[in-house]
Interface confidence: low
C-alpha cells in the first residue's frame, strides 16, 4: 500500500494539461490516488491518472506517432510525387513533338500521301502515349499496322499513281504484300526494335516512381498496434501521472521503442534500398535506344528513309505487285 | 531529302526553349532525381532515430524518464528499465509486419526484378538479330543506334533532347503540390500535444 | 560562452562588394548550420542565406540568389558572406546567427535560430 | 518564396495576456518565435512550435495549429515591450520571416 499523499498535493498541473487534450476535468482525481486499476503507467507510489486517462493517452500517442510519420515522409512523397507528374506530361510532350515532327516530314515530303498519312501516324502515336500509360499493346502489332496502313497509300499515289482509287481488295492484297516482300527493307524491324526497347524502359519507369508513392501510402497511413500504443504512453505521458510535466524521455529508451514500434516498417528497408539502387542502374541504362526522347524525335527520320527504301526499290516492287495482286486490280478495274 | 522547317513546329513553344541557358533535358531531370532519391536510402531503417529527434527527448537535461521513473540521463537505467515488466518488445518485433506491409514488400520485390530485367548490360548481343537479312549498302549499317536520325543527304536532325524548362512547372509551387494534404498538422487539439 | 561576432560591414557604392565574416566561438562550429539574415532601417527581420554544417548545402533568399556567396571555414570556426552587385537596397544590419538543427543521415530538420551576433551595419549608397 | 503574416501591432496592459497569430506556414516545418527589443539583436523565444529555450520565462507560450501559429504571452510587463518575429522554413529550406509584430504595453 503506498503511503498517503502529503496534505498538500494535489493533481493541479496534470489536470490543466490533460484539459488541453480532453476539455472536461473528470477523469482526473483531485489529488494524487493508488491507481491499482491502472494498465499502462503502472505507479510506484500515488497517482494523478485514471484508467480513461490512460486510454485517452494511448489512443493520443497513436496519434502523435501517426502525424511524426507522415511529417517524415512528407518531402520524399513530394519529391516522387512531383517527378512521377513531371516525367508523365515530358513524355507525353515528346510524343507529342514526335508525332509533330513525323506529320512535318509527309507534309514536307510527300505532300500526296497527306491527310492519310497523319491518320496513320495519329493513330500510331496514340498508341504509343497509352503503351506509355500501361495499356496491354503490342509495340511490333503498333509498327507493323503503321506500315500495312502507309504501304497502300504509298503504292496507290507515290508507286503506281495511275491507279484509279484503292479499293478494299487491293488495299488487303498490298498489306500482305508489305510483309511478304519486305517492302521497307529492314526498317520496321528497326523501329520495332528501338521503339519497343525505349518505351518498355519508359514505362517500367513511370510504373516504378508510382509504385514508389505507393511505398510512401503505405507506410504514411499505418496504424499502430495496441502495444505499440501502450510502450508510446508509457514513454510520453506516464510521467505526467506522477506530476513530472517538464520531463522528457531518455534518447536510448525512445529508440528502444521505435524500433519496437517501427519493426514492421523497418523490414521495407531492404527492399527500399534495392528499389532505389535499380532504379539509379534503369536510368543510366537509359541512352541511345533505351532513350524514347532519342528514339521517338528521331523516327521522322527513319521512316523517311524507309519510304526512300521503297522509291529506290520501285521498279522492281511495282512489277512484282503487279503479279502478286493482279487479281484484285483485274477484280477492280471490270 | 527530309526537309523541316522551323515554321512547320506545330508546337511553337519548343523554338524558345533552345534558349535556355542551363540546358535541362529529360536525362539530366532523371539523373537529378536519382540522385535525390539516393539521399533517402536510409529512409525506413532511419526512420525510429528520425522520430525520436522530432519528438520530445532529453537532450541537455541531466534526468530524463525511462518510462517508470526519472533516472540520470547517461546512466544504463536509462534505456533498459523502462523495459523491464512490461510487454515483451521482442514479442513485438517477432510478430512481423502488417499485411498491407507485407503486401508492399511484395510489389517492391516485383518491380526490382522487373528492373533489374530491364538493366541487363545492354552488349550489342542483344541487337545482332538485326544484321542478319542484311539492308543495302548505305541503309544504315550494323549499328542500330546510328540509324535514329538516318540518311546521310544532308537531312536536318533534330537535336536529341528537348528543353522541357519552358514547358514543364518543374519547380511547382509547394502549395499546389501533390501530397500537400498530406502535411503533418494537428488536427482540433487533438495531436498538438507534446508538453514541455 | 556561445558567441557570434560580424565584421566586414560598411558603406559602400552601388555596384560595390563588401565580404563579411561571422566569427564563432563556444560551440562546435561544424556540427551547426548557419544563416545570415538582415533588417533593412526600420523594417522586419529577412533571411538572406544559409549553409548546413558540412558546407555541402547552400540556400538563398530569390532577392540575393546570384549576388551573394555563402561559406564557410570550420578549421577558422568562421562564416562568411560575399556580395556582390550591391544595391541600395541591400542596405541594412546584417546579423549571422547559428541554427538548432537535427541531422540523421538525410535528415536535416531545422528549429530556429538559437544564437545571434550583434549585427554589422552595410550602408549602399552613391 | 512562401510568406508568413503577422499582425503589425499588439497591445495590452501590465498583467494581461496578449496574443500574437502568424499564419501561412504551409510546409509542414515548425514555427518559431523571436523577441527583439528595441535596438538589440533578435533572440530566440520559442522553437519547435511550443519549446522554449532556457530562461525564457514560461509566461510566453507556442502553439499551432495547420497553417497558422500563435504566440501567448501571459501577464504581460513593460519589459515585454518589443518587436516579435514568427519563422518557418519552406520547402526549398529557405528561412521565412513574418512581417514582425509590434507589442506596446500600455
Known amino acids: 500500500q503506498p503511503p498517503p499523499p502529503p496534505p498538500d498535493a494535489t493533481c493541479h498541473q496534470v489536470r490543466s494539461f490533460f484539459q488541453r487534450l480532453q476539455p472536461g476535468l473528470k477523469w482526473v482525481p483531485e489529488t494524487p490516488v493508488p491507481g491499482s486499476d491502472l494498465q499502462v503507467c503502472l505507479p510506484k507510489g500515488p497517482t494523478c491518472c485514471s484508467r480513461k486517462m490512460e486510454e485517452k493517452y494511448q489512443l493520443t500517442a497513436r496519434l502523435n506517432m501517426e502525424q511524426l510519420l507522415q511529417s517524415a515522409s512528407m518531402e520524399l512523397k513530394f519529391l516522387i510525387i512531383q517527378n512521377a507528374a513531371v516525367f508523365q506530361e515530358a513524355f507525353e510532350i515528346v510524343v507529342r513533338h514526335a508525332k509533330n515532327y513525323t506529320n512535318a516530314m509527309f507534309k514536307n515530303n510527300y505532300p500526296s500521301l497527306t491527310p492519310q498519312a497523319f491518320e496513320f501516324v495519329g493513330e500510331f502515336f496514340t498508341d504509343v502515349s497509352l503503351y506509355i500509360l500501361g495499356s496491354d499493346i503490342n509495340v511490333d502489332d503498333m509498327v507493323n499496322e503503321l506500315f500495312d496502313s502507309l504501304f497502300p497509300v504509298i503504292y496507290t499515289q507515290l508507286m503506281n499513281p495511275g491507279l484509279p482509287d484503292s479499293a478494299l481488295d487491293i488495299n488487303e492484297c498490298l498489306r500482305g504484300a508489305r510483309r511478304d516482300l519486305k517492302v521497307f527493307g529492314n526498317f520496321p524491324k528497326l523501329i520495332m526494335t528501338q521503339v519497343s526497347k525505349s518505351l518498355q524502359v519508359t514505362r517500367i519507369f513511370l510504373q516504378a516512381l508510382n509504385l514508389g508513392i505507393e511505398v510512401i501510402n503505405t507506410t504514411d497511413h499505418l496504424k499502430f498496434s495496441k502495444d505499440c500504443g501502450r510502450m508510446l504512453t508509457r514513454m510520453w505521458y506516464c510521467s505526467y501521472c506522477q506530476g513530472l510535466m517538464m520531463v522528457k524521455p531518455c534518447g536510448g529508451y525512445c529508440n528502444v521503442v521505435m524500433q519496437g514500434c517501427m519493426a514492421g516498417v523497418v523490414e521495407i528497408d531492404k527492399y527500399w534500398r534495392e528499389y532505389i539502387l535499380s532504379l539509379e542502374e534503369l536510368v543510366n541504362g537509359m541512352y541511345r535506344i533505351y532513350d524514347m526522347e532519342n528514339v521517338l524525335l528521331g523516327l521522322f527520320s527513319t521512316i523517311h528513309d524507309s519510304i526512300q527504301y521503297v522509291q529506290k526499290n520501285a521498279g522492281k516492287l511495282t512489277t512484282t505487285i503487279g503479279k502478286l495482286c493482279a487479281h484484285s486490280q483485274q477484280r477492280q478495274y471490270r | 531529302s527530309a526537309y523541316y522547317p522551323e515554321d512547320l513546329f506545330i508546337d511553337k513553344k519548343v523554338l524558345k526553349v533552345a534558349h535556355v541557358e542551363h540546358e535541362e533535358t529529360l536525362s539530366s531531370r532523371r539523373r537529378e532525381l536519382i540522385q535525390k532519391l539516393k539521399s533517402f536510402i536510409s529512409f525506413y531503417s532511419a526512420l525510429p532515430g528520425y522520430i525520436c529527434s522530432h519528438s520530445p527527448v532529453a537532450e541537455n537535461d541531466t534526468l530524463c524518464w525511462n518510462g517508470q521513473e526519472l533516472v540520470e540521463r547517461y546512466s544504463q537505467k536509462a534505456a533498459r528499465n523502462g523495459m523491464k515488466n512490461q510487454f515483451n518488445l521482442h514479442e513485438l518485433k517477432m510478430k512481423g509486419p502488417e499485411p498491407v506491409v507485407s503486401q508492399i514488400i511484395d510489389k517492391l520485390k516485383h518491380i526490382n526484378q522487373l528492373l533489374r530485367t530491364m538493366s541487363m548490360p545492354k552488349g550489342r548481343v542483344l541487337d545482332k538479330n538485326l544484321d542478319e537479312e542484311g539492308f543495302e549498302s548505305g541503309d544504315c549499317g550494323d549499328d542500330e543506334d546510328e540509324c535514329i536520325g538516318g540518311s546521310g543527304d544532308g537531312m536536318i536532325k533534330v537535336k536529341n533532347q528537348l528543353r522541357f524548362l519552358a514547358e514543364l512547372a518543374y519547380d511547382l509551387d509547394v502549395d499546389d503540390a501533390p501530397g500537400n494534404s498530406q502535411q503533418a498538422t494537428p488536427k482540433d487539439n487533438e495531436i498538438s500535444t507534446f508538453h514541455n | 560562452e556561445v558567441q557570434l561576432v560580424e565584421s566586414g560591414g560598411g558603406l559602400v557604392q552601388p555596384g560595390g562588394s563588401l565580404r563579411l565574416s561571422c566569427a564563432a566561438s563556444g560551440f562546435t562550429f561544424g556540427e551547426y548550420a548557419m544563416s545570415w539574415v538582415r533588417q533593412a532601417p526600420g523594417k522586419g527581420l529577412e533571411w538572406v542565406s544559409g549553409m548546413s554544417g558540412s558546407g555541402d548545402g547552400t540556400y538563398y533568399a530569390d532577392s540575393v540568389k546570384g549576388r551573394f556567396t555563402i561559406s564557410r571555414d570550420n578549421s577558422k570556426n568562421t562564416l562568411y558572406l560575399q556580395m556582390n552587385s550591391l544595391r541600395a537596397e541591400d542596405t541594412a544590419v546584417y546579423y549571422c546567427a547559428k541554427e538548432m538543427d537535427y541531422q540523421l543521415g538525410w535528415m536535416h530538420y531545422y528549429y530556429g535560430m538559437d544564437v545571434w551576433g550583434q549585427g554589422t551595419t552595410v550602408t549602399v549608397s552613391s | 518564396q512562401s510568406v508568413l503574416t503577422q499582425p503589425p501591432s499588439v497591445s495590452g496592459a501590465p498583467g494581461q495576456r496578449v496574443t500574437i497569430s502568424c499564419t501561412g506556414s504551409?510546409?509542414?516545418?515548425?514555427v518559431h518565435w523571436y523577441q527583439q527589443l528595441p535596438g538589440r539583436a533578435p533572440k530566440l523565444l520559442i522553437y519547435?512550435?511550443?519549446n522554449r529555450p532556457s530562461g525564457v520565462p514560461d509566461r510566453f507560450s507556442g502553439s499551432n495549429s495547420g497553417t497558422s501559429a500563435s504566440l501567448a504571452i501571459t501577464g504581460l510587463q513593460a519589459e515585454d515591450e518589443a518587436d516579435y518575429y514568427c519563422q518557418s522554413y519552406d520547402s526549398s529550406l529557405n528561412a521565412i520571416f513574418g512581417g514582425g509584430t509590434k507589442l506596446t504595453v500600455l
Open positions: 504551409s510546409s509542414g516545418y515548425d
Open positions: 519547435g512550435s511550443n
